[in-house]
């Protein structure tokens, strides 16, 4: 942004009114009057150049300084060709000097060069000569120099004339501020710039209207710099929740809009399944039956908890019962979906029932199922089992409602053989084993395993589809570990108990007796 | 009916050696594994060991966390097994007591291992403290 | 080792069905069989090879053993059934006695 410029003294607009002091008085520089363009124009002019060692000063008017800390000085002004004169005037000079002193009150003619300091050496980039002149065409020349920084209530300008043949056209004395602006929502004031060229003055904004500084982010601030311009900005406002940029400022979003923080986004439309909302909303509500999780985006439509599973299957296996089901028809909207299976056991006989989570296995843990299958393994004989898969999403937790389906399984897996020694000699074991009526026709052969007790390492398998078996070609007087299983088209029945049977020592009698 | 009647000191010294006797009377005593259990105060069972005297030999089974410092014998002249645990420490303060199972081990070729313990004795509370 | 693990506590109302699981790896091949243990006294014999009670015992006692859980049933119950309870097997990988944690019945 452009400079502002503050303008102290101004000898052009003051009309010939200021009333300069001259010293010495009544010699060297003079006030003149000119006509251009049908308008008086005043200037101050020396031109003793044949005299020789002229010192000849004009002060401006004492100057307040106000705020100003640094002051630019423009000059306009004219200068002779010494050669325009004749013999080339020895003692002729083509520059002259500018001087300034502060001081705290106007010394009114008390004049001393002593208190004045010199500021340089004002040299022409353009001399006049003598052709220019006599065709009234005189070539003006603009310096501006600057003096800083200044601490006294007021002060003086003065010009030096040492020989030259000056016309002093305009004297215009200004300093400069940093104008007020508006960036990135911030509001910088009006600020004086600063007196040393090096150094910039940091100045604070503030946000406008329904604008804040985004959390973790920096606070507005711009630097001033010597020429007053704005320089080098840090931080920044955005919009505050509720409000969006339009140009420089903030503005409530509209009915049906939302914005759920400070930041640069517009305004959002309200996401399905909300309530319009009223003006400058920082979010929109759910209708009723939907709801937003704690982590959804306000941006995200609101959702609602799934229907049950679609279809649910129990497919009995023996002591296991595999669950299958189809995701729910309605997801509520949402992709998060998991289910948790739920286990109840009634006894047949005195229609009791309870939770069964602590006697049977599931093949992976049965809450936060993300697959839409689990096994569920060592089911009891002849128990009533329902199964329940409650389907739930991220907003289940929302409401009191629970969306589910339940499916019923009796387990008829065959009862564990009841297995018995029927006879023993010192290398065999003879063993039979029964299982209730209704259940052999489903039994397609028995397996029976036995190995050395205390022999763990390894162990022997006979497959008949008989109820007896005849082990052969054992150790005497050594006890074996016998086990006997169902085998049915569903898989394996469940097993026996683990017998101990002991056959006979060499000096045992009787081959076979029990 | 068969009666368990068990006896010993009571109070020991880190490092000294426990010494229990349990003494049968009104049963059989070969074919049974007769056994040691223990129970720490205010916390559940644990079995020490079991021994069976069959003919002139002695069939010993020890809890494998135990079983460098447990010894049980038998005198099958007074009826007795005895249970002697060495080294003891604050943790093996517990009440002490002898079992009889259910069924002698073998009947006819059919085994019981681990069977249930339907005679217990009163019970010795050994406590450890220096 | 083979390990047997019991609920630490049960709760029931007077005249109501209490059961006590235990559970173990293929519990249901072995013989289980559970005691009850009263404060300062010995524990005693309630059930035994699953499901058989010794004499003396009340018919209100039963067992049951499949799978990977046997289960203690105490029907009716009253205040006098207030004790610590006990499963125990025998487990034929390492030849020794194991017993459960025990269970705390309260009668409410």
């Known amino acids: 942004a452009q400079g502002k410029e503050v303008v102290l003294l101004d000898f052009a607009a003051a009309g010939g009114e200021l009333g300069w002091l001259t010293h010495p008085y009544g010699k060297g520089w003079d006030l003149m009057q000119n006509i251009m363009n049908d308008m008086p124009i005043y200037m101050y002019s020396v031109c003793n150049v044949m005299s020789g060692d002229q010192d000849n000063w004009l002060r401006t008017n004492w100057v307040y300084r106000g705020e100003a800390e640094r002051i630019f000085i423009e000059l306009k002004f004219t200068v002779r060709d010494c050669n325009s004169f004749p013999g080339g005037a020895s003692s002729c000079k083509e520059t002259f000097n500018l001087y300034y002193a502060e001081s705290d009150l106007d010394y009114g003619t008390n004049f001393q060069k002593r208190l004045f300091t010199k500021i340089d050496t004002i040299a022409p980039d353009e001399i006049t000569v003598s052709s220019d002149f006599e065709a009234r065409h005189v070539k003006l020349n603009v310096e501006e120099r600057s003096v800083g920084p200044l601490t006294r209530k007021g002060f003086y300008l003065a010009f030096q004339d040492i020989g030259a043949c000056v016309a002093l056209l305009s004297v215009r004395v200004y300093y400069k501020k940093c104008p007020e602006l508006l960036q990135g929502l911030a509001h910088f004031p009006e600020t004086i710039a600063g007196s040393d060229a090096p150094s910039l003055a940091t100045v604070a904004g503030t946000c406008v209207d329904h604008a804040v500084v985004p959390p973790g982010g920096e606070e507005p601030r711009m630097h001033c710099a010597v020429d007053g311009e704005w320089l080098v900005p840090i931080g920044q406002c955005l919009c505050q929740a509720g409000y969006e940029k339009v140009e420089d400022a903030c503005q409530a979003c509209s009915p049906g809009f939302f914005k759920f923080e400070a930041s640069e986004s517009p305004c959002l439309e309200c996401p399905e399944h909300t309530l319009p909302s009223p003006e400058g909303a920082t979010s929109c509500e759910c209708e009723e039956g939907f709801f937003r999780a704690p982590q959804d985006p306000a941006s995200m439509p609101c959702t609602r908890p799934p229907s049950a599973p679609h279809y649910l299957t129990a497919v009995g296996m023996g002591a296991k019962v595999e669950l299958r089901w189809t995701p729910p028809q309605d997801s509520g909207g949402r992709e998060d979906i998991v289910y948790s299976v739920t286990c109840e056991q009634c006894w047949p006989e005195s229609g009791e029932c309870g939770p069964c989570e602590a006697s049977v296995r599931y093949s992976e843990p049965p809450h936060g199922l993300t697959r839409t299958s689990v096994t569920v393994s060592d089911l009891e004989p002849h128990m009533n089992y329902t199964f329940t898969v409650e389907a739930r999403n991220g907003v289940s937790g929302l409401v009191t409602s629970r969306s589910f389906r339940t499916a019923s399984v009796s387990i008829n897996q065959t009862e564990p053989p009841k297995v018995r020694l029927e006879g023993r000699s010192t290398t065999s074991l003879s063993v039979s084993w029964s299982i209730p009526p209704p259940q052999q026709s489903r039994v397609w052969k028995y397996e029976v395993t036995y190995r050395k007790k205390g022999d763990s390492n390894s162990y022997n398998v006979r497959r008949t589809e008989g109820f007896s078996v005849t082990l052969d070609d054992l150790a005497p007087d050594t006890t074996y570990l016998v086990q006997v299983q169902a085998l049915t088209q569903e898989g394996q029945g469940a097993g026996s108990k683990v017998h101990e049977f002991q056959t006979l020592s060499p000096e045992g009698s009787g081959n076979l007796a029990v | 009916q068969v009666q368990l009647q068990q006896w010993g000191a009571g109070l020991l010294k880190p490092s000294e050696t426990l010494s229990l006797t349990c003494a049968v009377y009104?049963?059989?005593?070969?074919?049974?594994?007769w056994s040691w259990i223990r129970q720490p105060p205010g916390k559940g069972l644990e079995w020490i060991g079991e021994?069976?005297?069959?003919?002139?030999?002695?069939?010993?089974n020890y809890n494998p966390s135990l079983k460098s410092r447990v010894t049980i014998s038998v005198d099958t002249s007074k009826n007795q097994f005895s249970l002697k645990l060495s080294s003891v420490t604050a943790a093996d303060t517990a009440v002490y007591y002898c079992?009889?199972?259910?069924?002698?081990?073998?009947?006819?070729?059919?085994?019981?291992?681990?069977?249930?313990?339907?005679?217990w004795g009163q019970g010795t509370m050994v406590t450890v403290a220096s | 080792s083979y390990v047997l693990t019991q609920p630490p506590s049960v709760s029931v109302a007077p005249g109501q069905t209490a059961r006590i699981t235990c559970r173990g790896n293929?519990?249901?091949?072995?013989?289980v069989h559970w005691y009850q243990q009263k404060p300062g006294q010995a524990p005693v014999l309630v059930v035994y090879?699953?499901?058989d009670r010794p004499s003396g015992i009340p018919e209100q006692f039963s067992g049951s053993n499949s799978g990977n859980t046997a289960t203690l049933t105490i029907s009716r119950v009253e205040a006098g059934d207030e004790a610590d309870y006990y499963c125990?097997?025998?487990?034929?990988?390492?030849?020794?006695?194991?017993f459960g944690g025990g269970t705390k019945l309260t009668v409410l």
């Open positions: 079992a009889k199972p259910l069924r002698p081990h073998c009947t006819n070729g059919v085994c019981y291992s681990g069977d249930a313990f339907d005679i």
């Open positions: 009104g049963g059989s005593f070969s074919g049974y594994y």
């Open positions: 021994i069976n005297h069959r003919g002139s030999i002695n069939y010993n």
């Open positions: 293929n519990i249901g091949s072995k013989n």
């Open positions: 090879d699953d499901s």
């Open positions: 125990q097997v025998w487990d034929h990988s390492s030849d020794h006695v194991v």
